[in-house]
Structure formats: structure tokens, C-alpha cells
């Protein structure tokens, strides 16, 4: 007869174990009983479990409550045993020694291997913001036995970096990944991807990139300056720019108090009908955490009655 | 045939020792875990202590721990128990058994006795 | 410890009498028990062992059933010889543990 077992046997933590150990025999063979043992070098055997033909399942103090046979129908040549809820301590060498009659004593060793999945971490770096050079945007740390993969998935372009450090029974790996902030990257998402075999799919923790910036500003509302002229209504200008944090606008005139009867309202200024009084210098004034921005417009608010008046000078002038 | 002979009780004061001996005879002795049971006088049966055929595994009860002392010879096919610090409630009649070793520290039950040895602790 | 509680403590039964004596252990011991027969001044006599198996040169009409914590030790038909008290063991773990014994005196 023979032994038939596995040379690894594969478990998650808090699963069951199967330890499998089945003697094939010849007819009219008996198994009188079978001892399991845990015997990882430099150690002494340390007793499972002792399943006998007629006194049943002994269990080691150790590990009562944890053995037990596999369920019926059992096959009285099979001593394999179950390891209920398998922790990472239990990762080691097993043997299991069958007492056979009368082909006598055979013995068989297997690995149990615990899979410790990784419950991975994502930590944000420090605030990004635009202008600044290489820049740590996340790291992402996960611990496992044996030590996860950690990768990135973005298609903002960076550069990642990982180290490992060991421990007695698992591994710890944590991946950076760099960038030189930009506004494009803005509200991008940024995936720290972890697979490991104890894993049935990859575990994926994704953090949207926030990249501080302020844009130029500029006034939009003057392109045409023959629209600038007394009495009419409607006029108004608009102060551009964009940034994140989502900027603030605040409107002030350079040579003077803003008339009476002209409204802001955030990033516009809205004018009443024009008069003589509303030409100046405007200032719109972008500021948000990141930095601050000023543009300046000159209004011309034109007196109709003056450029006819001016025009038929010309003309009589000519 | 398989015999187990146990000699060494008698009359001992409190505090006193006694060295008992338990020759065995017809089986193969070193294979074998030998004990000592106990039972005093109208009384159950108390296990008292164990020894593995090769001495390596010893086990006493609590109530004897640190007072008794397991030994064998096996050259001698002999089996023994030093008791020392004697008290009145280790008066008993001492038996000696064997059992077969299964595997690690498990074995069956004890399948052939002595006849036993008295012993009284008694001022 | 394992306790182990035998009932009854002791009984009167006939010659021919089948008669049952239980045994409970404070834990599961498989079939880690013995049952064994003592009469006065001699050494206990291993009966049964392994809970159920019959010890070489002891009687068919003692048999033995159980495992786990509930255990039975019965006698189909009392002979004159069989008057004796029983003991209970579980050798499951160390310390081995006996029942109080049960005494079978005759009615």
C-alpha cells in the first residue's frame, strides 16, 4: 500500500483545512489508526490529532475544538482531518503517520500554507498644487501573507516607487506614486490596484487627485466699445478665470468708489443705464487658497451727441 | 502470562516515605506505559501517576505532585513509585497497571493490574 | 479535569436480571472508555474497552455502547459471579479520570 496526500495544502485565514492523508492498501488491509503532527523543523513533533479505529478522534488540548473528521460517509483507510478556521500560526509542516495491518507504519508530510489577504490603505500625500515640482500624491500600504501586489491604475502620468518590509509571518508593501501637479489632472482618479492570491479579485481603492490652482484672470464685456455709450441698458462685464478651490471675484474701481445703482454679483458687474459717471478703471480681483489674480478694464462710456457732433466737424472740416 | 507484582507497602507515619516496586513479567515492558492507581479504604479508584516506556513522559495527579516520584527500569522489568512527605489520606492500596502507548501522550486503557500494595500513613 | 458521574451508585438486581449501569463524562471523550469489575480485595478486571469492545476472555453478556459523553454498560443476564462494583474510566486525556463505581449486590 501507499500514502496519498498533497504536498501543499492552500487555505485563507479563517477558512477550513483539509488535511488530506489516504492509505491505499491492498485488499484485506486495515488501518489501525492514524497520527497527525505538526513538525516544523527544530521542533518536536506537537500532537493534532489521533484518529484510531476503535477509540475514534483524540485531539491535542492545543487544538480542541479545531479537528474534527471529515463528514460521513468516511472511508475507514481515509485519516484525513479537517483544521477549522485555519489562522496564520498553523501555517507549517504536518505529518501524517498511518499504523496499517499488517503492511505496518507508513508516514506522510504536506505544507499547509495560510493565505492572509491584505486589507490595503490608501493615504492621500500632501495638498497638490499647480507649480509645484515632483510630488508625492498617494501611497498605498497592504499586508499579506505572501506579500501583495500593489500597482496603480490612472491615466494620469507618474512615477511610483514601492518598498517591502518583512515581518515574521507576512509582508507589508507599500507603493508611492509621484507627479508634477497640473490643473489637467484635476478630479482624475488615481486607483491603487492590490491583487494577491488570496484574493478572489483585485482589491481597488481609488482617490480623485485635487490639484490647486488659479488661472490668469481676464474681463469679458468690452469687445465692442461702441455698445459703451450713455443711456444704455444692460451693460455689464464678466471676470474669467477658473482654479480650484473654485475661486472668489470681487470687484473694485481704481479711481473711485463704484457708482451708485452698479451690482456685483459675484464674478459679474452689472451696470445700470450708462452715464459719464460709469467711465473708470475697473479691477476684478480672483483670489482663492491657492493664490490670487487682478485684471484691469478701462470702461469709455461714449456721449452719442459728442461723436455726431465730432463727426460733422470732420466732415465740415473736410 | 502476563503478571504485575507490586511489593513495598506497609505502616508509615505522616511525613515518612516509602519506595514501592511493581515487577512485571510475560510481556515486552519497555513497550508499555506503565501507572499507579490508588484506592483508599472503601473508596473509589484515583489515578495517581504515568510513565512512558522509555521514561520520557511523566504525569502525576495534582494530589501527589512534587511528593511522588514515577521511575522504571527496564533492564530490570520493574516499575516504581518513591513517595515521600507522607499524609494520612495517601493511605491506599497502591496498584500498578499497564497500557499501551497509541501515539504522542494517548494511550488505551489499562488492560492487566497488579494486586496491589497497602500502604497506611498512620501516626 | 474530566468528571465522570456513574448512576446509580448502587443497585440490587436477580440472578438473570439484565442490568444497565450509565456513565456520563463532563466532556466528549470519543470512545476513549473503559469499564471495568472489581470485587472485593482482588484488582479491577478490564471488561470493556474502547467504549464498546469486549477485552479478551470476559463474557458476551457484557456489552458496552456509546461515545461522546453518554455511556452504557450493560449486563443481558446477571450470573452469581458478576455481583461486584463497576468502575467507569475515560483515558481521553491526563489526568485519566474513574466514575464513583456502582455496586451490584444481589436482591
Known amino acids: 500500500g501507499e500514502l496519498e496526500t498533497s504536498d501543499v495544502v492552500t487555505v485563507v485565514l479563517g477558512q477550513d483545512a483539509k488535511l488530506p492523508c489516504f492509505y491505499r492498501g491492498d485488499s484485506g488491509e486495515q488501518v489501525g489508526q492514524v497520527a497527525w503532527a505538526r513538525v516544523d523543523a527544530g521542533e518536536g513533533a506537537q500532537e493534532l490529532a489521533l484518529l484510531h479505529s476503535k477509540y475514534g478522534l483524540h485531539v491535542s488540548p492545543a487544538y480542541e475544538g479545531r479537528v474534527e473528521q471529515p463528514p460521513p460517509p468516511r472511508n475507514p483507510l481515509d485519516g484525513s482531518v479537517l483544521l477549522r478556521n485555519a489562522v496564520q500560526a498553523d501555517e507549517g509542516e504536518y505529518e501524517c503517520r498511518v499504523s496499517t495491518f499488517p503492511a505496518g507504519s507508513f508516514q506522510a508530510r504536506l505544507r499547509l500554507r495560510v493565505l492572509v489577504p491584505p486589507l490595503p490603505s490608501l493615504n492621500p500625500g500632501p495638498a497638490l498644487e499647480e507649480g509645484q515640482g515632483l510630488t508625492l500624491a498617494a501611497s498605498c500600504t497592504a499586508e499579506g501573507s505572501p506579500a501583495p501586489s500593489v500597482t496603480w491604475d490612472t491615466e494620469v502620468k507618474g512615477t511610483t516607487s514601492s518598498r517591502s518590509f518583512k515581518h515574521s509571518r507576512s509582508a507589508a508593501v507599500t507603493s508611492e506614486f509621484h507627479l508634477v501637479p497640473s490643473r489637467s489632472m484635476n478630479g482624475q482618479p488615481l486607483t491603487c490596484v492590490v491583487s494577491h492570491p488570496g484574493l478572489l479579485q483585485d482589491q481597488r481603492i481609488t482617490h480623485i487627485l485635487h490639484v490647486s490652482f488659479l488661472a490668469e484672470a481676464s474681463v469679458r464685456g468690452l469687445e465692442d466699445q461702441n455698445l459703451w455709450h450713455i443711456g444704455r441698458e444692460g451693460a455689464m462685464l464678466k471676470c474669467l478665470s477658473e482654479g480650484q478651490p473654485p475661486p472668489s471675484y470681487n470687484w473694485t474701481r481704481l479711481d473711485g468708489p463704484l457708482p451708485s445703482g452698479v451690482r456685483v454679483d459675484g464674478d459679474t458687474l452689472g451696470f445700470p443705464p450708462l452715464t459719464t459717471e460709469h467711465s473708470g478703471i475697473y479691477v476684478c480681483h480672483v483670489s482663492n487658497e491657492f493664490s490670487s489674480r487682478d485684471s484691469q478694464v478701462t470702461v469709455d462710456v461714449l456721449d452719442p451727441q459728442e461723436d455726431s457732433g465730432k463727426q460733422v466737424d470732420l466732415v465740415s472740416a473736410s | 502470562e502476563v503478571q504485575l507484582v507490586e511489593s513495598g507497602g506497609g505502616l508509615v507515619q505522616p511525613g515518612g516515605s516509602l519506595r514501592l516496586s511493581c515487577a512485571a513479567s510475560?510481556?515486552?515492558?519497555?513497550?508499555?506505559?506503565m501507572s499507579w492507581v490508588r484506592q483508599a479504604p472503601g473508596k473509589g479508584l484515583e489515578w495517581v501517576s504515568r510513565i512512558s516506556g522509555d521514561s520520557a513522559n511523566i504525569r502525576y495527579a495534582d494530589s501527589v505532585k512534587g511528593r511522588f516520584t514515577i521511575s522504571r527500569d527496564n533492564s530490570k522489568n520493574t516499575l516504581y513509585l518513591q513517595m515521600n512527605s507522607l499524609r494520612a489520606e495517601d493511605t491506599a492500596v497502591y496498584y500498578c497497571?499497564?497500557?499501551?502507548?497509541?501515539?504522542?501522550?494517548?494511550?488505551?486503557?489499562?488492560?492487566?493490574w497488579g494486586q496491589g500494595t497497602l500502604v497506611t500513613v498512620s501516626s | 479535569d474530566i468528571q465522570m458521574t456513574q448512576s446509580p451508585s448502587s443497585l440490587s438486581a436477580s440472578v438473570g436480571d439484565r442490568v444497565t449501569i450509565t456513565c456520563r463524562a463532563s466532556q466528549g471523550i470519543s470512545s476513549y472508555l473503559a469499564w471495568y469489575q472489581q470485587k472485593p480485595g482482588k484488582a479491577p478486571k478490564l471488561l470493556i474497552y474502547?467504549?464498546?469492545s469486549l477485552q479478551s476472555g470476559v463474557p458476551s453478556r457484557f456489552s458496552g455502547s456509546g461515545s461522546g459523553t453518554d455511556f452504557t454498560l450493560t449486563i443481558s443476564s446477571l450470573q452469581p459471579e458478576d455481583f461486584a462494583t463497576y468502575y467507569c474510566?475515560?483515558?481521553?486525556?491526563?489526568?485519566?479520570?474513574f466514575g464513583q463505581g456502582t455496586k451490584v449486590e444481589i436482591k
Open positions: 510475560g510481556f515486552s515492558f519497555g513497550t508499555y506505559g
Open positions: 474510566q475515560q483515558h481521553y486525556t491526563t489526568p485519566p479520570t
Open positions: 474502547a467504549a464498546s
Open positions: 497497571a499497564r497500557a499501551e502507548l497509541l501515539a504522542f501522550d494517548v494511550y488505551t486503557a489499562s488492560d492487566y
